[in-house]
């Protein structure tokens, strides 16, 4: 026969059991709340720091590009590519047609102030895109020049000059004194490149990398 516990002992045991249960409950709640806090704070901090980074990046560009047009890249809502608002975009670059007439050097300096260069054309597709925005009765400076007059053409961004990816009009380049390249329209050959004097004012095309935020 098991001897019955004294009421005092029973109460003591119950109290001890309850204490253990409540302790476990409190610890569990604490653990859960820690887990919840961690799970919500980490992404929040991540998003916050990404936003801060974006804002500082935008501030960088704001001095010469007060307004950007951005599009979502792929399916990820966090990746955006932007071009300054009046610029057009193609692949990974932004383009701006400058209608002011200036010398080649001044045109390049103007592009540079906007964080860009005179346009470097790398493919036929790129040229086909660019010409959609050009006027047939105008000429536009490219970022291509031969300052030494020795037919050592060079792109402003140091991209190697590849004779196989050039779109000179037939018979061009044809003059050692004409050390800067333009793109213009000739009824016989459509759009192509021509060498002209660098100091003669022309319109121009600026190109910059897209801004990723």
């Amino acid at each position: 026969m098991v001897p019955e516990e004294e009421p005092q002992d029973r109460e003591k045991g119950l109290w001890w059991f309850q204490l253990k249960v409540w302790s476990m409950a409190v610890v569990s709640i604490l653990l859960l709340s820690v887990c919840f806090t961690v799970s919500s704070v980490v992404p929040h901090n991540f998003m916050y720091s990404k936003t801060v980074k974006r804002l500082s990046k935008l501030r960088e560009y704001q001095q010469y590009h007060p307004s950007l047009t951005c599009v979502m890249e792929g399916k990820d809502i966090e990746d955006w590519s932007c071009c300054p608002t009046p610029w057009t975009s193609f692949q990974s670059s932004c383009y701006f047609i400058s209608t002011g007439m200036q010398s080649w050097t001044k045109s390049q300096k103007n592009c540079s102030v906007m964080g860009a260069d005179l346009v470097v054309i790398n493919t036929r597709e790129e040229q086909d895109f660019i010409i959609q925005n050009l006027k047939r009765n105008s000429s536009y400076f490219l970022g291509l020049s031969d300052p030494g007059g020795r037919r050592h053409w060079q792109w402003v961004d140091q991209t190697p000059y590849n004779e196989n990816v050039t779109f000179w009009h037939s018979g061009e380049p044809n003059n050692l004194d004409e050390r800067c390249a333009i793109i213009n329209f000739r009824s016989s050959e459509e759009w192509g490149w021509n060498d002209i004097h660098c100091h003669v004012p022309q319109k121009s095309i600026c190109k910059m990398k897209k801004i990723y935020i």
């Epitope: 010398s103 050097t105 020049s145 300052p147 004194d177 050390r179 800067c180 004097h197 660098c198 100091h199």
Partner: antibody, heavy 121, light 111 residues
């Protein structure tokens, strides 16, 4: 030896015309851009017109645009300046100058002796 | 148009002394280390003669007492030592863009 010899200057009435010539020798004329630069009595130098070596481009300041025409005859090694609707302020010594390109610009490395144009009634 | 301002308008120098003429452009005439500013000498009754091209290059046949320096908007022609035959008007000219423009000239007289 490079030589540039201007001719054709003289006295002309306002509204009249004159054609200046510049005979070049001692260099391959067809390979160089050429310019006309003028100097009014007691004044500084003022560029008037430029023609590229291949005859593809001509440039003028606003002060003469539409009135003056620069041309060249590479077969004759000659440069010309046709001046129409002449005004008193066109009175000057007119120099023919050869352009030598350097990097993105150029300078005038040889000058003729000049020919005097006087516009007066 | 790029305006070139020369100073002084005139100066008188003793033989053997140094003459310094400055030319200030209304905007930069330099690009990637090339300075498209040139200097000419014009003696009375004669056409201009090229002295210095691209800011500091001495034209062949020009005496070494002539030198040029400067970049961007500020350029200097120095004659050292000055000789009697250097009495003339001196002009700067830019060619980085059309129209090519000349400074107003500096008249150098030898005392």
């Amino acid at each position: 030896e490079v030589q540039l010899v201007e001719s054709g200057g003289g006295l002309v009435k306002p509204g009249g015309s004159l054609r200046l010539s510049c005979a070049a020798s001692g260099f391959t004329f067809s390979s160089y851009g050429m310019s006309w630069v003028r100097q009014a009595p007691g004044k500084g130098l003022e560029w008037v017109a430029t023609i590229s070596s291949g005859d593809s481009y001509t440039y003028y300041p606003d002060s003469v645009k539409g009135r003056f025409t620069i041309s060249r005859d590479n077969a004759k090694n000659s440069l010309y300046l046709q001046m129409n609707s002449l005004r008193a302020e066109d009175t000057a010594v007119y120099y023919c100058a050869r352009q030598l390109y350097y990097s993105y610009g150029y300078y005038f490395d040889y000058w003729g002796q000049g020919t005097t144009v006087t516009v007066s009634s | 148009d790029i305006v070139l301002t020369q100073s002084p308008a005139s100066l008188a120098v003793s033989p053997g002394q140094r003459a310094t003429i400055t030319c200030r452009a209304s905007e930069s005439v330099s690009f990637h280390g090339t300075h498209l500013m040139h200097w000419y000498q014009q003696k009375p009754g004669q056409p201009p003669k090229l002295l210095i091209y691209a800011a500091s290059n001495l034209e062949s046949g020009v005496p070494a007492r002539f030198s040029g320096s400067g970049s961007e908007t500020d350029f200097t022609l120095t004659i050292n030592p000055v000789e009697a035959e250097d009495t003339a008007n001196y002009y700067c000219q830019q060619s980085i863009e059309d129209p090519p423009t000349f400074g107003g000239g500096t008249k150098v007289e030898i005392k």
